[in-house]
């Protein structure tokens, strides 16, 4: 077995880091491979083990527990096949952050002919990402997802108001949201579960 290139790793910056390796042949990841990792810079940091699983016949993925990461954490990692080291390297959770996807996306009717979307960001107040996340809201027609509007939410509050009449009346719409860190390097989270609603409003007389 040989590892092809470097692994792709990212961290949710709260409890888990995920690494994925491409291999040169089909492999049963959990029985043939083992990933050892430990926090660098400290002699007595614990040696930890992750048993990978297959995400494809030649691709292994490992979900490593890295509780409450901070900016300076660096992990030394070694991928082993029985008694042979296939790869070694290091990973910084703060260096490639893929945040947890938001949840509880909810649509509220608002007084002044506006919809209000709210969602939950899943980071506690003692986590760097609590005040750091920016959001992207995607609103699309359910019957034509290629027709969509994107809102970039650069303020801290997980909410977005928009006029009801910016969307067509009598049409079903779907909304979803994803987040990313402004401070730390990384990528967008996965999309939240989507919600769907029927957009209806009374057209002004002149447009009827």
């Amino acid at each position: 077995i040989k590892v092809l290139g470097e692994p792709t790793c990212f961290s949710d910056y709260i409890r888990t880091s995920t690494c994925e390796w491409f291999l040169d042949s089909a492999v049963d990841c959990s029985s043939q491979l083992c990933l050892h990792y430990r926090l660098m810079f400290f002699e007595f940091s614990e040696n930890l083990t992750c048993i990978p699983r297959n995400s494809a016949s030649t691709v292994c993925v490992c979900h490593m527990e890295m509780n409450r990461p901070v900016q300076s954490d660096r992990y030394q990692m070694e991928l082993w096949a029985e008694h042979r080291q296939l790869w070694q390297g290091s990973f910084s959770p703060s260096g490639n952050v893929k945040p947890l996807a938001p949840d509880n996306l909810t649509l509220h009717t608002n007084v002044s002919d506006e919809w209000l979307l709210t969602w939950n960001n899943l980071y506690p107040s003692n986590n760097l990402l609590y005040k750091d996340l920016i959001s992207m809201v995607n609103i699309s027609r359910e019957d034509n997802p290629a027709e969509f509007i994107v809102y970039n939410v650069t303020y801290k509050e997980p909410r977005l108001s928009f006029p009801i009449n910016i969307l067509m009346s009598g049409v079903y719409y779907t909304a979803r949201v994803r987040v990313r860190s402004q401070i730390l390097t990384g990528t967008w989270s996965e999309w939240s579960p989507s919600i769907t609603w029927y957009n209806h409003f009374q057209l002004p007389l002149i447009q009827r």
Partner: antibody, heavy 119, light 110 residues
Framework: EVQLVESGGGLVQPGGSLRVSCAAS????????MAWVRQAPGKGLEWVSH????????QYADSVKGRFTISRDNAKSTLYLQMNSLKPEDTALYYC????????????WGQGTQVSVSS | HSAVTQPPSVSGSPGKTVTISCAGT?????????VSWYQQFPGTAPKLLIY???KRASGIPDRFSGSKSGNTASLSISGLQSEDEADYYC??????????FGGGTHLTVL
Amino acid sequence: EVQLVESGGGLVQPGGSLRVSCAASGFTFSSYYMAWVRQAPGKGLEWVSHIHAGGSLTQYADSVKGRFTISRDNAKSTLYLQMNSLKPEDTALYYCVRIYGDATSYDYWGQGTQVSVSS
Amino acid sequence: HSAVTQPPSVSGSPGKTVTISCAGTSSDIGGYNYVSWYQQFPGTAPKLLIYEVNKRASGIPDRFSGSKSGNTASLSISGLQSEDEADYYCASYRSNNNIVFGGGTHLTVL
């Protein structure tokens, strides 16, 4: 504004003890590794010790291992260095530093506190 | 502890480029991308210039750059200015979990 203010230095006899402190402000102390770096008069920099953000993991230079203890109180945003069995060669200006990035990257430094070991 | 090796002094003319070397081994500089550079003026605390070999610290002008080849790291200062006259230190992570500083280099601007 990030500030690190050391205190507790002084003159101590060989074999004596001293505890120096560093009061941190202007940042979330509990999210950062911290370290002590010293500089003997007219000499270069020497890493002494560093500590994980949570406080449970520590590391020491061979020259101080077994004699010095680094600790932190995140509730008080304070870093400590307990120095026992002091030797003349421990005489130096002791800097409290914040670690940013890997453990060699010290982005904020205090003004230092002078420790002199002499009979 | 044995420090990584820096030249005690270097000099250069205003506007020119100087390079300060930091020689180590495969157990420190050669083995990890954890090398930092500091600038220190007399009577003041050091200031972080470069970290993780080539990343500039916040507010550091791009006249300062870091690199690494094999077991040697380098700090280059281009467009040399009189106010760059100072002591410069490298620091590296070492495989026994220790941090090691170079002995320091005094830069003289002629």
